[in-house]
């Protein structure tokens, strides 16, 4: 892998209404099933087609779920986390952490702030270069007056 991989971490409150087949996603993680090394958090591993989460569109595979209906998901066994979702009721409020990749490296999931998946430095470098050229041209123009 070339270079360093940086992530822009954002949090969002997502309110889902349980559909006919439920909330429509799978999870991994828990104190007994660490999916991410040194992190026993709960992560979204699969969004089911045409399920409530997919139709809402905000929850993404790879998102970390911090809480369900205000209840923290820290230090839970995997099955306890599953049961918490299953017993969460009809209207479910999720506090979610999105991780958006902003550097080169393997492609992470794309959030709303980066629809094209272009790393930020690829945008900033040309903008900076154009600014420098414009400033130089302006200075030359002023000298000629």
């Amino acid at each position: 892998m070339n270079g360093r991989v940086d992530y822009l971490v954002t949090e969002e409150e997502i309110n889902l209404t349980r559909g006919p087949s439920g909330l429509g996603f799978n999870i991994v993680g828990g104190t007994d099933q660490q999916y991410v090394s040194n992190d026993s958090g709960i992560y979204v591993s699969r969004i089911k087609e045409n399920g409530a989460a997919a139709l809402d569109g905000r929850l993404q595979e790879g998102d970390k779920i911090l809480s369900v209906n205000g209840q923290d998901l820290k230090n839970l066994l995997h099955q306890d986390a599953v049961d918490l979702f299953r017993n969460a009721g009809y209207a479910v409020s999720l506090r979610v952490q999105h991780r958006l990749q902003v550097q080169n490296g393997p492609i992470g999931h794309r959030g709303e702030g980066d629809p094209s998946g272009i790393p930020i430095f690829m945008v900033l470098v040309p903008v900076f270069a154009l600014t420098m050229v414009a400033a130089w041209a302006f200075m030359r123009y002023r000298q000629q007056l």
């Epitope: 429509g24 799978n26 999870i27 099933q33 979204v44 591993s45 599953v82």
Partner: nanobody, 127 residues
Framework: HVQLVESGGGLVKPGESLKLSCVAS????????MGWFRQAPGKEREFVAA????????DYADSVKGRFTISRDNAKNTVYLQMNSLKPEDTAVYYC?????????????????????WGQGTQVTVS
């Protein structure tokens, strides 16, 4: 993503046993729910058995209960199906299937739509 390869199929006589294996590559299986399905000629794909990520929960089709045993070895990235007292009606192509994570909805391991990854299958003939 996970690639699944089944092995262990073959031709056996009624009453005999076979052990199928499903080896995964591409990712560790430890967070995956694994299942076995089968499809006989001219019939729909049918659920056989499933095992939870930890191996402590198994589900079986009524037609194989007491004869088949599903198990897994996460260290070897392998899932097994031990088939005893085989019958002619067990003749089919047997497929291994996998899905990452546990559904937060009602658990339905017999539904093929619950699985994202499938092997190519191994033929079992009881005759």
């Amino acid at each position: 993503h996970v690639q699944l390869v089944e092995s262990g199929g073959g031709l056996v006589k009624p009453g005999e046993s076979l052990k199928l294996s499903c080896v995964a590559s591409g990712e560790t299986l430890s967070s995956y729910i694994m299942g076995w399905f089968r499809q006989a000629p001219g019939k729909e794909r049918e659920f056989v058995a499933a095992v939870s990520w930890s191996g402590n929960q198994q589900d079986y089709a009524d037609s194989v209960k007491g004869r088949f045993t599903i198990s897994r070895d996460n260290a070897k990235n392998t899932v097994y199906l031990q088939m005893n007292s085989l019958k002619p009606e067990d003749t089919a192509v047997y497929y291994c299937a996998a899905v990452i994570g546990s559904t937060v909805d009602s658990y339905s391991p017999s539904d093929p739509l619950e699985y994202d990854y499938w092997g190519q299958g191994t033929q079992v003939t009881v005759s």
